[in-house]
Interface confidence: low
C-alpha cells in the first residue's frame, strides 16, 4: 500500500531512509540534458523473497541530443511529479541495512541520474530527519517518521524534531519569550492560535518504538 502523501515537512530539516521497504518505487529521473532510454523503466521497484530483497528494473539515461533514439519521453503521472524528493546523501545514522529483512539498500547511482531522488514509499516505511547545516536540533531524541495505515488512510507520524538557528532561543515555534515569571508559561501558549493549535503529528509517530509524538509514536 503506497503512502498517500509525503513525510512531514520540518522547517530547516531533511529526511532520509536508511533502508526501503519492499514495494517502494524510485523514479528513474535523469539530469538535465538526459532522458530515459526508449525502453527504459519508469521506476525501480524494491522486491524480495524469503531470503533477500533487491531492486527490480534498472534506470538508464541517455543524452537528449542522441539522434538515433526517439525524442518522446513518457510523462510522469502528476502524482509522481509532486512526490517529495530526498537529496542523495550519506546515511544520517549508522544502520546496517542488510540486517533489515524485507528492505532494500539505497540503490547505487546510475549514470547521469538526477540530483534528487523521488521515492514512493509504502506503509511501514520509516524515514529519519536531521537539521540542515546551520541549524541545531531542539528536543534531542528520535527524529523519525513512519508511514502508518489507520482506518484505511495512510499518514506519517510526526518526528520529534525542531530545528532552530544558533541565535534563536530554545522555544517552540510561535512561542513568545516569557516576560516576567520564568516559571510560568507565556499566556500566548494557549491563546495565540485563537481557534487552532501532538499527539505524535506523533502524533505520535513507530508503533512499537518509543519514538515521538501523539499520533502514533506516543511512547
Amino acid at each position: 500500500e503506497l503512502c498517500d502523501d509525503d513525510p512531514p515537512e520540518i522547517p530547516h530539516a531533511t529526511f532520509k531512509a536508511m533502508a526501503y521497504k519492499e514495494g517502494t518505487m524510485l523514479n528513474c529521473e535523469c539530469k538535465r540534458g538526459f532522458r530515459r532510454i526508449k525502453s527504459g523503466s519508469l521506476y525501480m521497484l524494491c522486491t524480495g523473497n524469503s531470503s533477500h530483497s533487491s531492486w527490480d528494473n534498472q534506470c538508464q539515461c541517455t543524452s537528449s541530443a542522441t539522434r538515433n533514439t526517439t525524442k518522446q519521453v513518457t510523462p510522469q503521472p502528476e502524482e509522481q511529479k509532486e512526490r517529495k524528493t530526498t537529496e542523495m546523501q550519506s546515511p544520517m545514522q549508522p544502520v546496517d541495512q542488510a540486517s533489515l529483512p524485507g528492505h532494500c539498500r539505497e540503490p547505487p547511482p546510475w549514470e547521469n541520474e538526477a540530483t534528487e531522488r523521488i521515492y514512493h514509499f509504502v506503509v511501514g516505511q520509516m524515514v529519519y530527519y536531521q537539521c540542515v547545516q546551520g541549524y541545531r536540533a531542539l528536543h534531542r531524541g528520535p527524529a523519525e517518521s513512519v508511514c502508518k495505515m489507520t482506518h484505511g488512510k495512510t499518514r506519517w507520524t510526526q518526528p520529534q524534531l525542531i530545528c532552530t538557528g544558533e541565535m534563536e532561543t530554545s522555544q517552540f515555534p510561535g512561542e513568545e519569550k516569557p516576560q516576567a515569571s520564568p516559571e510560568g508559561r507565556p499566556e500566548s501558549e494557549t491563546s495565540c492560535l485563537v481557534t487552532t493549535t501532538d499527539f505524535q503529528i506523533q502524533t505520535e509517530m513507530a508503533a512499537t518504538m518509543e519514538t515521538s509524538i501523539f499520533t502514533t509514536e506516543y511512547q
Epitope: D4, D5, E9, F172, G174, L193, T197, D198, Y218, Q219
Partner: antibody, heavy 103, light 109 residues
Framework: PGASVKVSCKAS????????MHWVRQAPGQGLEWMGI????????SYAQKFQGRVTMTRDTSTSTVYMELSSLRSEDTAVYYC?????????WGQGTLVTVSS | QPGLTQPPSASETPGQRVTISCSGS????????VYWYQQLPGTAPKLLIY???QRPSGVPGRFSGSKSGTSASLAISGLRSEDEADYYC???????????FGGGTKLTV
C-alpha cells in the same frame, strides 16, 4: 438534533502544513475525548471509531484553517470542541468552540 | 468510557507532594508515550508532560512524569493553590488507532 455543525480552526505563527491537527471535545463537566486527526499537508485523516461516518475533517491551506464537521447531531454532542496542534504532544490548543444541540 | 484509568480526585495541602496515577494496557501506555495535560477551570488544556517525562519550556520543575509497564504517574511537589485543576493522561492506542485520554483527576489543594 439531526443537523450538522462545522467548526473552524485558524492557525497562525507557524508552518501550517508541517504539523498534524487534532480535534478533541469535552462535554459539560466531563473529560476529554479524542475525535480524530488531519494532516494539513496532504489532507489525509483518521477518525475515532465512535465518530466514523459522522465526522469529516478538512483543511484549507490558503487560509491555514482546518474544519471539523459533525453530522446527525444529538443532544449528547453538546460540548466544547477544541483543535490542537501536534508536535511534542498537543502543545497548542484553540480556546474551544461551544456547540449546543437542543430542540 | 475513558481508555485510560485515573482516580477521579486527589487532595493535598500546599507545599506537599501529590501523585496522580494513570493505568492503561499494552496497546497504549505499554507501547507508546504518555502525555499529561493540565486544565485550569474555564480554559483549554495545557501540555504539561510529553514523552513520559519531558517538560515543555515554561513548565516548572515541580511537575514530573514517569512510566513503568502499562502505568504512568504524574508527581507534583511543592503544591500551590494555582495547581488546582483537572489533570489528564493520554497516549496513542495501537488497537484503536487513536488517542485515548484518562477520565481526568480533579486536584484540590
Amino acid at each position: 438534533p439531526g443537523a450538522s455543525v462545522k467548526v473552524s480552526c485558524k492557525a497562525s505563527g507557524y508552518t501550517f502544513t508541517s504539523y498534524y491537527m487534532h480535534w478533541v471535545r469535552q462535554a459539560p463537566g466531563q473529560g476529554l475525548e479524542w475525535m480524530g486527526i488531519i494532516n494539513p499537508s496532504g489532507g489525509s485523516t483518521s477518525y475515532a471509531q465512535k465518530f466514523q461516518g459522522r465526522v469529516t475533517m478538512t483543511r484549507d491551506t490558503s487560509t491555514s484553517t482546518v474544519y471539523m464537521e459533525l453530522s446527525s447531531l444529538r443532544s449528547e454532542d453538546t460540548a466544547v470542541y477544541y483543535c490542537a496542534r501536534d508536535i511534542l504532544g498537543l502543545d497548542y490548543w484553540g480556546q474551544g468552540t461551544l456547540v449546543t444541540v437542543s430542540s | 468510557q475513558p481508555g485510560l484509568t485515573q482516580p477521579p480526585s486527589a487532595s493535598e495541602t500546599p507545599g506537599q507532594r501529590v501523585t496522580i496515577s494513570c493505568s492503561g494496557s499494552s496497546s497504549n501506555i505499554g507501547s507508546n508515550y504518555v502525555y499529561w495535560y493540565q486544565q485550569l477551570p474555564g480554559t483549554a488544556p495545557k501540555l504539561l508532560i510529553y514523552r513520559n517525562n519531558q517538560r515543555p519550556s515554561g513548565v516548572p520543575g515541580r511537575f514530573s512524569g514517569s512510566k513503568s509497564g502499562t502505568s504512568a504517574s504524574l508527581a507534583i511537589s511543592g503544591l500551590r493553590s494555582e495547581d488546582e485543576a483537572d489533570y489528564y493522561c493520554a497516549a496513542w492506542d495501537d488497537s484503536l488507532s487513536g488517542v485515548v485520554f484518562g477520565g481526568g483527576t480533579k486536584l484540590t489543594v
